[in-house]
Interface confidence: low
Amino acid sequence: EVRLSVPPLVEVMRGKSVILDCTPTGTHDHYMLEWFLTDRSGARPRLASAEMQGSELQVTMHDTRGRSPPYQLDSQGRLVLAEAQVGDERDYVCVVRAGAAGTAEATARLNVFAKPEATEVSPNKGTLSVMEDSAQEIATCNSRNGNPAPKITWYRNGQRLEVPVEMNPEGYMTSRTVREASGLLSLTSTLYLRLRKDDRDASFHCAAHYSLPEGRHGRLDSPTFHLTLHYPTEHVQFWVGSPSTPAGWVREGDTVQLLCRGDGSPSPEYTLFRLQDEQEEVLNVNLEGNLTLEGVTRGQSGTYGCRVEDYDAADDVQLSKTLELRVAYLDPLELSEGKVLSLPLNSSAVVNCSVHGLPTPALRWTKDSTPLGDGPMLSLSSITFDSNGTYVCEASLPTVPVLSRTQNFTLLVQGSPELKTAEIEPKADGSWREGDEVTLICSARGHPDPKLSWSQLGGSPAEPIPGRQGWVSSSLTLKVTSALSRDGISCEASNPHGNKRHVFHFGTVSPQTSQA
């Protein structure tokens, strides 16, 4: 009895060659082998036949059905299909007649797989309203030229959307399959969804799932897309952009931006206004929600408002917001005295530093960077020549950095001179010798600056030189004589307010001794 070894199912990728095997079992010297095709009408046209005689196979091709490239039989009677096409998906019947051994027949089913092209998606480019109470068309997905027909699934933020195929107000999908001229299948799926506000940030895409030989599967994802949604305003924010301090102050002269944002889409129109005496002073109407105040002045302090002109908003939504613009300023400081204050020695005075500013400025007085006290009043009592110098009133706004001012005055103390004297290399009484050299130093201060003079110019007085803290010094270098010992030398400091004198004495002066 003749038996056939024919695989019941053969799978091949489109474009590849496939060989359908039909091998009789056992040894048969002479048999007839035929290949038939089962077409859609149920007819079985004969494709090829072969006669085995001994070890040689005589092949005859019958009806190639216009296939290109045509069917072929190889030397073992196997049916060869080069470049498999979708149209080759048929049942192929092999019949072997082996005389007395009988006749056998077997069928091979050929499945041809085609991977579809890249998945394409066409999103709805319009503006979709979340206020629609039924599903709206979201996008159409196309998977072209596959075999068998692919399946399409939809995804939101990477999560598969479980939508029915029946119309539904919450969402559904429709599908349509088309057989192309090539025999390949194309699938179009359209997604409909009822949209919500959180869909504004959602990422959507579709994927085509297709079959491959040996039960394997593939997936081709489309690019992702986002939707343009129309949703009403629910919240409005209105704030001072930059620059403003943590306490909410802006500096006079700064350019200030007031920023208003509603969370509706598309961006509604904003009306920016100032409230004065319960009247709206409309400053600007725009789509950005920005109001720029260039070189802001203290007169622009007050209540500013922003209104979102969104007619789709719910009745209970507060579409207006206001804020207080607080403009900080600091005017130049004014002193109760002029730039120079001239006072007599030992007198007293009070100097007032006036300031206008907002928020309330802090005042402090300094002299030579040394703090003298806080507040507007500077009290000067029993002034001395050490009180001479420059006094600074500093104003600052603690809550507004970089906004500060200073004003200063110079104090000149009027008085008769003070005198300080010194001897360089002084000697105790009785230790001076005739001809010893000595340098005398006389320092004075007062206002106006005192003149220094010496009672005897037998020596060489140096030019008076100004020193620190208003002192003027003069030095005189001379040789000690017995006449000096008798009379002494005086230094005198004088100015219009009086004079002071100091007499240098040398005691006993010994005569010069000759050296051995």
């Epitope: 002073e281 109407v285 260039e294």
Partner: nanobody
Amino acid sequence: QVQLVESGGGLVQPGGSLRLSCAASGFTFSSYAMSWVRQAPGKGPEWVSAINSGGGSTSYADSVKGRFTISRDNAKNTLYLQMNSLKPEDTAVYYCAKSWTVRIGQIYHHPTDYWGQGTQVTVSS
């Protein structure tokens, strides 16, 4: 700082035309309404015309309605006043002014905070 510089004034015969220009700098021109104001010799200032920030809305004093046209070019930061059918009573110094719109009830006012130096327009035969 805000600067407004007018030009285009001059001597013109009654029935003639002039076009005034105002070059603006020192502020965001496209964010503000603008006005033209004039002052005749020995008289107080008189508001002439205003235009909103985008240029889509204009208003005029009754005395110039139908003869004067206000316009602006935000790309060039420039305000214009086209004056046709000029009359001797239009003689004045014309000032361009940074402005805004105030609604009190149903009446719109056009207060100004900065004016230019002005350009003289003289209408005489």
